[in-house]
């Protein structure tokens, strides 16, 4: 028998984290995002579910909707109408895909203090929202859009083409929801509430993915989803705009697609209202290296939307795909003509540009060997954005203000020196014209949310500082986290290392690599987390490392586009390089190195295990992609092109996990997948398993019946992490 190797944190009254702590969410943190309703007013749902109104300037606060009203319909969410007369209450939340869900909606009249009766909303509703002015309601029911001029009015049906799994109006189909829009909706009100723009997705010709949902019945149900895999027929999209003042007078008006886009397969990528009669649409060729931003105007006399060519702005990538993960959206100036947008500069770094007439004449606003990440708000005199510029750490996020009123514009970092050790990764939430804003810091210390004056940047108050969490962590031995970079040849890789408490460089520790590695992702971030890997370091004495290899984001296009058309090569290579460097550091036990990942990370971990290097003793792949032909068209083709002979079929074929089945012979492999995974279909793991069986390679596997890509139901999640913990401890010869 091997002597058991038990890691015991030495002489300390503090206790180590337990797996139970993680599974119970004992150390989860809170953030505070104001629900802005004006320049200086916001709503927030309190701990006890009252909806509270706050006025920053008068310091006034009161309950506008009591928890008893919420409870009366089991509401879990709410939305105040802009005229403040009504609130919708959302209940019976029923999750569909990543963003989509259906729910039951009740309208509460704040004036009368009662629910609106008569012409009640149908159920379940797929999406519902107020107009930006007044209290018009738009909602999607059974794939059709309806309009109510007032909550108590009868509904007006705007679309009639909706049909389950065939035609979607105002809501995206599966692939658009997951890979393009990242929303549950595909409709947008004009700023004054006159027009409602929406997308119609026609999935009639899309192949169906079908899988069993076992449930409790005698026979399983079959789930059918129109899901275009790489190279398959895609949804056909059309954008319409309806005048909601007289919806019966003139029907929905179709917005024309730019001719350079319409000449072959294309995608709609986003819609931005510029003014009450000007709209901006973004389109993308199916080969996603050309994006066109088209500005369209309403012609009242013709009841038509016109998109002149001089208002078509083309963004093209010559080294990869357009945009980052998504093509960025424009932030328009007050003049409703010029806008600010993030795209790659001549050096391949994503930066803010100001476009007044043509993209060719764009004025670069930010520059440097770092990237602008997001434009939060453009006002008359300021532009607020986030970037990873500060101190050269790609995994940080700070908020900056550019005074665009000044000439030349001056730049100020709003967050860099606020709580320098605690806070290095920020996001923000601005009131309408940025008179006030909230900063939400995610770490590396305990998250904290604060309220600020938009003119002076002065902190007004702390909204949430996670005091309870701070107190409960006082007696916990947390691991030490380091973020550093390693160099190999001409390449620099940032890594995060999570070191066990009382880490001693002279000792040897098992190493677990956690990998995601997907294009335009980032794992090495300066954020706070107490999760499974924190536990593994704290209690089990395992060193954890996360490495951002080529293909990951925010370090320039040269690094990002390195993986273009050849997924599965450099992502794996760079993990292997990093492991070799970690071994050189002297505190890693070479005999006990493992790798694990989920989704794209499952793909990379599988390929790393099958790399034939002998570096890994064991590894885990959860819900891995096994072939890019099995994954969604929009995603696969963005990075790989088409799986056709005259395009990139060869690399589609030789980048599969199945092609490397033989190489799993000398590693312990645990393959895990949910059978109801709508995203990375169970098919992926079924094919890996088949290939391993055919190659007579032993492996371990676990499926989770009726679980989706997140394997997130309480019982399944507990089982999953317990199972993976046992597997790892066995691999590393750590006793239970």
């Amino acid at each position: 028998l091997r002597p058991s190797r038990v890691y015991k944190p030495e002489g300390n009254t503090k206790r180590a984290l337990t797996l139970k702590d993680i599974l119970n969410g004992t150390f989860s943190y809170k953030t505070y995002f104001p629900n802005w309703i004006s320049e200086q007013e916001y709503l927030h749902q309190s701990e006890d579910d009252n909806i509270v109104f706050y006025n920053i300037e008068t310091r006034e606060s009161y309950i506008i909707l009591s928890n008893s009203t919420m409870k009366s319909v089991n509401a879990t969410d709410y939305g105040l109408s802009p005229d403040r007369q009504f609130v919708y209450l959302e209940s019976d939340y029923s999750k569909l895909w990543r963003y989509s869900y259906t729910a039951t909606y009740y309208i509460y009249d704040l004036q009368n203090g009662e629910f609106v009766r008569g012409y009640e909303l149908p159920r379940p509703i797929q999406y519902l929202c107020w107009s930006p002015v007044g209290s018009k309601l738009a909602y999607v029911y059974q794939n059709n859009i309806y309009l109510k001029q007032r909550p108590g009015d009868p509904p007006f049906q705007i679309t009639y083409t909706g049909r389950e799994n065939r035609i979607f109006n105002g809501i995206p189909d599966w692939v658009y929801e997951e890979e393009m829009l990242a929303t549950k909706y595909a409709l947008w009100w004009s700023p004054d509430g006159k027009f409602l723009a929406y997308v119609e997705f026609n999935d009639s010709d899309i192949p169906i993915i079908a899988y069993s949902y076992y449930g409790d019945g005698q026979y399983p149900r079959t789930i059918n989803i129109p899901y275009p895999k790489a190279g398959a027929k895609n949804p056909v999209v059309r954008v319409f705009i309806v005048d909601t003042t007289y919806p019966h007078h003139v029907g929905p008006m179709e917005v024309p697609v730019p001719e350079m886009i319409a000449s072959s397969d294309y995608y709609f990528s986003w819609l931005t209202w510029v003014s009450s009669e000007r709209v901006c649409l973004q389109w993308l060729k199916r080969v996603q290296n050309v994006s066109v931003l088209s500005i369209c105007d309403f012609r009242e006399d013709w009841h038509a939307w016109e998109c002149p060519k001089n208002q078509e702005h083309v963004e093209e990538s010559r080294t990869g795909w357009a945009g980052g993960f998504f093509v960025s959206t424009p932030a328009f100036s007050q003049d409703a003509t010029s806008y600010y947008k993030i795209f790659s500069d001549k050096d391949g770094y994503k930066h803010i540009h100001y476009i007044k007439d043509t993209v060719e004449n764009a004025i670069q606003i930010t520059s440097g060997k770092w990237e602008a990440i997001y434009i939060f708000r453009v006002t008359q005199d300021s532009l607020f954005y986030s970037s990873n510029e500060f101190e050269g750490y790609p995994g940080r996020r700070n908020i900056y203000r550019i005074s665009i009123g000044n000439s030349p514009p001056s730049k100020k970092c709003v967050t860099c020196h606020l709580r320098k050790e605690r806070c290095q990764y920020y996001t923000a939430s601005f009131s309408y014209k940025a008179k006030y804003y909230a900063l939400v810091c995610y770490g590396p210390g305990l998250p904290i949310s604060t309220l600020h004056d938009g003119r002076t940047d002065q902190e007004i108050q702390v909204l949430e500082e996670n005091k309870e969490l701070e107190n409960s962590l006082r007696n916990i031995q947390l691991p030490k986290v380091e973020i550093k970079k390693l160099k190999d040849g001409g390449l620099t890789f940032w890594y995060k290392m999570i070191l066990p408490p009382q880490f001693d460089r002279s000792k040897k520790y098992p190493l677990l690599i956690q990998v995601y590695g997907g294009p335009c992702s980032q794992s090495v971030k300066s954020v706070f987390a107490v999760n499974w890997i924190t536990y593994l370091a704290s209690k089990e004495g395992i060193v954890i490392a996360l490495v951002d290899g080529r293909g990951t984001a925010f370090q320039g296009d040269k690094f990002l586009h390195a993986v273009y058309r050849k997924l599965g090569v450099y992502e794996v290579e760079d993990q292997l390089t990093a492991v070799r460097k970690f071994i050189e550091m002297g505190f890693i036990d070479e005999e006990r190195i493992a790798i694990w990942g989920w989704s794209y990370g499952g793909y990379v971990s599988s390929l790393a295990l099958a790399s034939g290097t002998g570096l890994f003793k064991c590894g885990i792949a959860v819900a891995p992609v096994s072939s890019w032909e099995y994954y969604a068209s929009i995603y696969s083709e963005r990075f790989m092109g088409l799986p056709t002979k005259d395009d990139n079929l060869e690399h589609y074929k030789n980048s599969t996990v199945m092609a490397r089945a033989e190489y799993f012979r000398n590693v312990d492999y645990l393959l895990i997948h949910g059978t109801a995974d709508d995203n990375v279909h169970f098919q992926n793991s079924a094919q890996i398993a088949k290939a391993l069986v055919n190659a007579q390679v032993d492996f371990q596997a676990m499926w989770y019946s009726d679980q989706n890509h997140g394997i997130s139901s309480g019982r399944s999640q507990n089982h999953l992490y317990t199972h993976m913990t046992h597997f790892l401890k066995q691999c590393f010869s750590l006793s239970d």
Partner: antibody, heavy 116, light 112 residues
Framework: QVQLVQSGAEVKKPGSSVKVSCKAS????????ISWVRQAPGQGLEWMGG????????TYAQKFQGRVTITADKSTSTAYMELSSLRSEDTAVYYC?????????WGQGTTVTVSS | DIVMTQSPLSLPVTPGEPASISCRSS???????????LDWYLQKPGQSPQLLIY???NRASGVPDRFSGSGSGTDFTLKISRVEAEDVGVYYC?????????FGQGTKVEIK
């Protein structure tokens, strides 16, 4: 490439009606204005009216109001112009055009001759 | 209806020389969105008209850069920097600011 193909030449008697068709191919039809323009022999261009097929509401020049009817069939991507109570001065080449602020496509023209 | 008046109605030109046509509208063609809804067309002998300039000053695709449009409100000009033999034909301005579109009478450009 967008193409507009019009119906063939017509010879009509005064007082009768003529219906000219314009079939679009190779591009989107619905969101664009389809205009009808005529040109009498040796004369300039005269705008008669138009329609946005997707909306279906036609607009007519005052001069032709009550005599012209413009329609569109989205399913066949075809627009129609019907002119009634024909007189000899309606003898002209009738063009359909798809316009979109910045680019236009014209049919080859249909010659309508009105003579007794 | 908006009345469009072109001048001159006939323009004899010498190849290589510049040429200019004026178009005046009876009402402003400047829309609240900032665009001037005025287009210029050329109809070559025996052909359908073709768009040259849209929204007052923007060249349509495929139109040589010797053609330029300028003006705002009620006064517009089409310029040809160096006339070529293939530029002969009748030039029309058309307003699209009003529900009822109207053409100018046309300017016949011919080689001297």
């Amino acid at each position: 490439q967008v193409q507009l193909v019009q119906s063939g030449a017509e010879v009509k008697k005064p007082g009768s009606s003529v219906k000219v068709s314009c079939k679009a191919s190779g591009g989107t039809f619905s969101p664009y204005t389809i205009s009808w323009v005529r040109q009498a022999p040796g004369q300039g261009l005269e705008w008669m009216g138009g329609i946005v097929p997707n909306v279906g509401v036609a607009t007519y020049a005052q001069k032709f109001q009550g005599r012209v009817t413009i329609t569109a069939d989205k399913s066949t991507s075809t627009a129609y112009m019907e002119l009634s109570s024909l007189r000899s001065e309606d003898t002209a080449v009738y063009y359909c055009a798809r316009d979109a602020a910045d680019r236009d496509y014209w049919g080859q023209g249909t010659t309508v001759t009105v003579s007794s | 209806d908006i009345v469009m008046t072109q001048s001159p109605l006939s323009l004899p030109v010498t190849p290589g020389e510049p040429a200019s046509i004026s178009c005046r509208s009876s009402q402003s063609l400047l829309h609240s969105n900032g665009y001037n809804y005025l287009d210029w067309y050329l109809q070559k002998p025996g052909q359908s008209p073709q768009l040259l300039i849209y929204l007052g000053s923007n060249r349509a695709s495929g139109v040589p850069d010797r053609f330029s449009g300028s003006g705002s409100g009620t006064d517009f000009t089409l310029k040809i920097s160096r006339v070529e033999a293939e530029d002969v034909g009748v030039y029309y301005c058309q307003q699209r600011n009003n529900k009822n579109r109207t053409f100018g009478q046309g300017t016949k450009v011919e080689i001297k």
